[in-house]
């Protein structure tokens, strides 16, 4: 069937269209094109005779049409009037006619649209704005974009006038955005430049910063006001209702108590005509005086005196605070606070109570600290210490002894030999000593402030012969695999070599044995029961040598896993059962028995006469060493058979 296809169907003005013929019959004489839906000679555009290949223009020919041998018609420079139907009339050789109709539509190329607005400065929550997309164009579709997004769904947005008008009801500051419109028809689409909606709003309630409302006398007051507003707000300040200045910031230097009051910021928007105010109450406090501490006793004596520290000045309705060593007061029965916290009493002062002490006065804003006060606690003298600790010296050497006792004020020292005063110095020096210098050397320390004195006596032996040493121990009963033991060879003597023997042999090489303190101290780490031996120390110098009596180490160990004897587990009925439990342990362990879980006696030996099969079961021996704090146990099964039922059974003990 003969058909006409328009390419394209929608044609832009000024462009061209091809009316393409499909299924053109064979053996044609010629054909003609007509404007409209029927053959009308008055509306003939062009005719074409195939035999002569002659094209003849008709009354509707515009000079823009070209006919092709295949009957297709090209129309150039399309105008709006070209819209409509076109009919092809085909005349076959047998003079039979055939017709086909096609059509196309002509649309203008759209111009770039623009947006007009009925209100360039709408007021928030009051005005509506109508945007209109210009120009009005027939057969065009109108679209809107907000911030390059399609329109959001909102009851405040309304499209009208074929979507050409966008109305925003009750505008808000959030409607401040970029708006664009777009026009579309089948042959073109154009988007407008953006229009920014300028919504007038505010002022909102102003915010005054900083939020701080309490100030101290002498500080600067610097308040800043801000209110959201378009256009920006104009600001005014009022103090106690009296206008001050039209600025966003209010600055008052060196404020006094008289500057206390209500501070009002007023924000004004000249375009919306609205005013909003915020009030803050500023309180200026007088600067309290710096506190200081007074004491009822500037030189208290340790363990005798009490000291009362008072925070000055006395101010009504004031909170007093105390610090010792930069910390809040510790809980102590020796520290007492008065009802108003103004007086801190130290009962029975000690040398550790020196401080420093601080008191504070708290006001509404901060705490004012006093300068620190240090107590001068008089103490001592403690028992003097004489050094060095040597007690044995060889003739011909120099004896130099020094005495020290903790004391405040520092102690005054005196030396006595065998009760006779020698000198009032801290150090005693005797050169080239002899045996005659042996004796009791006393250091006396005296505290002139407290009137107390203390003495220490040291026996000095001057002899070419060394004394018999002895061994002291830091742990007389160490626990195996747990404790360490330190043996020390006494006395400490000058220019002396210290030696050790274990069971009469020199020390074995062992990572658990360590010599220190010039070989004077022997330490055994992680003692074992095998360390329970005889230890001897020896001292020697160039002229003599001596050995201590042996010290035997008593190592606590065990209890090891017990052994129940005899080892037999099968018995004949009627025999006596006599079980003995033994566990290696130092000291001896506590023993107890259980038969089939039932507690029996607290003995090492369990005896049952004339056993029967009823005595079958589990026999448990439990051992505990109270010194090591350890326990152990073992379980043995006993079977008792009726007499004569089975050979090879034990007859019992």
């Amino acid at each position: 069937k003969l058909t006409i296809e328009s390419t394209p169907f929608n044609v832009a003005e000024g462009k061209e269209v091809l009316l393409l013929v499909h299924n053109l019959p064979q053996h044609l004489f010629g054909y003609s094109w007509y404007k409209g839906e029927r053959v009308d000679g008055n509306r003939q555009i062009i005719g074409y005779v195939i035999g002569t290949q002659q094209a003849t223009p008709g009354p509707a020919y515009s000079g823009r049409e070209i006919i092709y041998p295949n009957a297709s018609l090209l129309i150039q420079n399309i105008i709006q009037n070209d819209t409509g139907f076109y009919t092809l009339h085909v005349i076959k050789s047998d003079l039979v006619n055939e017709e086909a109709t096609g059509q196309f539509r002509v649309y203008p190329e759209l111009p770039k649209p623009s947006i007009s607005s009925n209100n360039s400065k709408p007021v928030e929550d009051k005005d509506a704005v109508a945007f209109t997309c210009e120009p009005e164009t027939q057969d065009a579709t109108y679209l809107w974009w907000v911030n390059n997004q399609s329109l959001p769904v909102s009851p405040r947005l309304q499209l009208s006038n074929g979507n050409r008008t966008l109305t925003l009801f009750n505008v808000t500051r959030n409607d401040t955005a970029s708006y664009k419109c777009e026009t579309q028809n089948p042959v073109s689409a154009r988007r407008s430049d953006s229009v920014i909606l300028n919504v007038l709003y505010g002022p909102d309630a102003p915010t005054i910063s900083p939020l701080n409302t309490s100030y101290r006398s002498g500080e600067n007051l610097n308040l800043s006001c801000h209110a959201a507003s378009n256009p920006p707000a104009q600001y005014s300040w009022f103090v106690n209702g009296t206008f001050q200045q039209s600025t966003q910031e209010l600055f008052i230097p060196n404020i006094t108590v008289n500057n206390s009051g209500s501070y009002t910021c007023q924000a004004h928007n000249s375009d919306t005509g609205l005013n909003r105010t915020t009030v803050t109450t500023i309180t200026v406090y007088a600067e309290p005086p710096k506190p200081f501490i007074t004491s009822n006793n500037s030189n208290p004596v340790e363990d005798e005196d009490a000291v009362a520290l008072t925070c000055e000045p006395e101010i009504q309705n004031t909170t007093y605070l105390w610090w010792v060593n930069n910390q809040s007061l510790p809980v102590s029965p020796r520290l007492q606070l008065s009802n108003d916290n103004r007086t801190l009493t130290l009962l029975s002062v000690t040398r550790n109570d020196v401080g420093p002490y601080e008191c504070g006065i708290q006001n509404e804003l901060s705490v004012d600290h006093s300068d620190p006060v240090i107590l001068n606690v008089l103490y001592g003298p403690d028992d003097p210490t004489i050094s060095p600790s040597y007690t044995y010296y060889r003739p011909g050497v120099n004896l130099s002894l020094s005495c020290h006792a903790a004391s405040n004020p520092p102690a005054q020292y005196s030396w006595l030999i065998d009760g006779n005063i020698q000198q009032h110095t801290q150090e005693l020096f005797i050169s080239n000593i002899t045996e005659k210098n042996s004796g009791l050397y006393t250091c006396q320390a005296n505290n002139s402030a407290s009137g107390h004195s203390r003495t220490t006596v040291k026996t000095i032996t001057v002899s070419a012969e060394l004394p018999k040493p002895s061994i002291s121990s830091n742990n007389s009963k160490p626990v195996e695999d747990k404790d360490a033991v330190a043996f020390t060879c006494e006395p400490e003597a000058q220019n002396t070599t210290y030696l050790w023997w274990v069971n009469g042999q020199s020390l074995p090489v062992s990572p658990r044995l360590q010599l220190s303190n010039g070989n004077r101290t022997l330490t055994l780490f992680n003692v074992t029961r095998n360390d329970a031996r005889a230890y001897v120390c020896g001292i020697q110098n160039s002229v003599s040598a001596n050995r201590s009596d042996p010290v035997t180490l008593d190592v606590l160990y065990g209890p090891d896993t017990p052994i129940i004897s005899p080892p037999d587990s099968s018995y004949l009925s009627g025999a006596n059962l006599n079980l003995s439990c033994h566990s290696a342990s130092n000291p001896s362990p506590q023993y107890s028995w259980r038969i089939n879980g039932i507690p029996q006696q607290h003995t090492q030996v369990l005896f049952i006469a004339k056993i029967t099969p009823n005595n079958n079961g589990t026999y448990a021996c439990f051992v505990s060493n109270l010194a090591t704090g350890r326990n152990n146990s073992i379980v043995k099964s006993i079977t008792v058979s009726a007499s004569g039922t089975s050979p090879g059974l034990s007859a019992g003990a």
Partner: nanobody, 118 residues
């Protein structure tokens, strides 16, 4: 006659406290080690705490550390076991046991029952 007499046992709720006493007569506890051993049905005997007078050392089973405290008053010839935060598993007969510091004698008390139950 040598005697060890325990007292202080009884019924207590979980979380409660008891103080057991072990009064010794017939000898001086000064040179001894004293322990408390507990026996509960179906469980092994356990040495829960011990103290040695000559060294002052105290030792505790892991199960009671931080809850039980052993002490002795040589002037009263009495040992004590302070039991706090008691649990159901502490239910047992508690025996006082004493060993000399050379291990040449061992004594036991007759036991006191502690029941922890709600």
């Amino acid at each position: 006659e040598v005697q060890l007499v325990e007292s202080g046992g009884g019924l207590v709720q979980p979380g409660g406290s008891l103080r057991l006493s072990c009064a010794a007569s017939g000898f001086n506890i000064k040179d001894t080690c004293i322990g408390w051993v507990r026996r509960a049905p179906g469980k092994e005997e356990e040495l829960v705490a011990s103290i040695c007078q000559y060294s002052g050392y105290t030792r505790y089973a892991d199960s009671v550390k931080g809850r039980f405290t052993i002490s002795a008053d040589t002037s009263k010839n009495t040992a004590y076991l302070q039991m706090n935060s008691l649990r159901a598993e502490d239910t047992a007969v508690y025996y006082c046991a004493i060993t000399s510091h050379h291990g040449d004698y061992n004594y036991w008390g007759q036991g006191t029952t502690v029941t922890v139950s709600s």
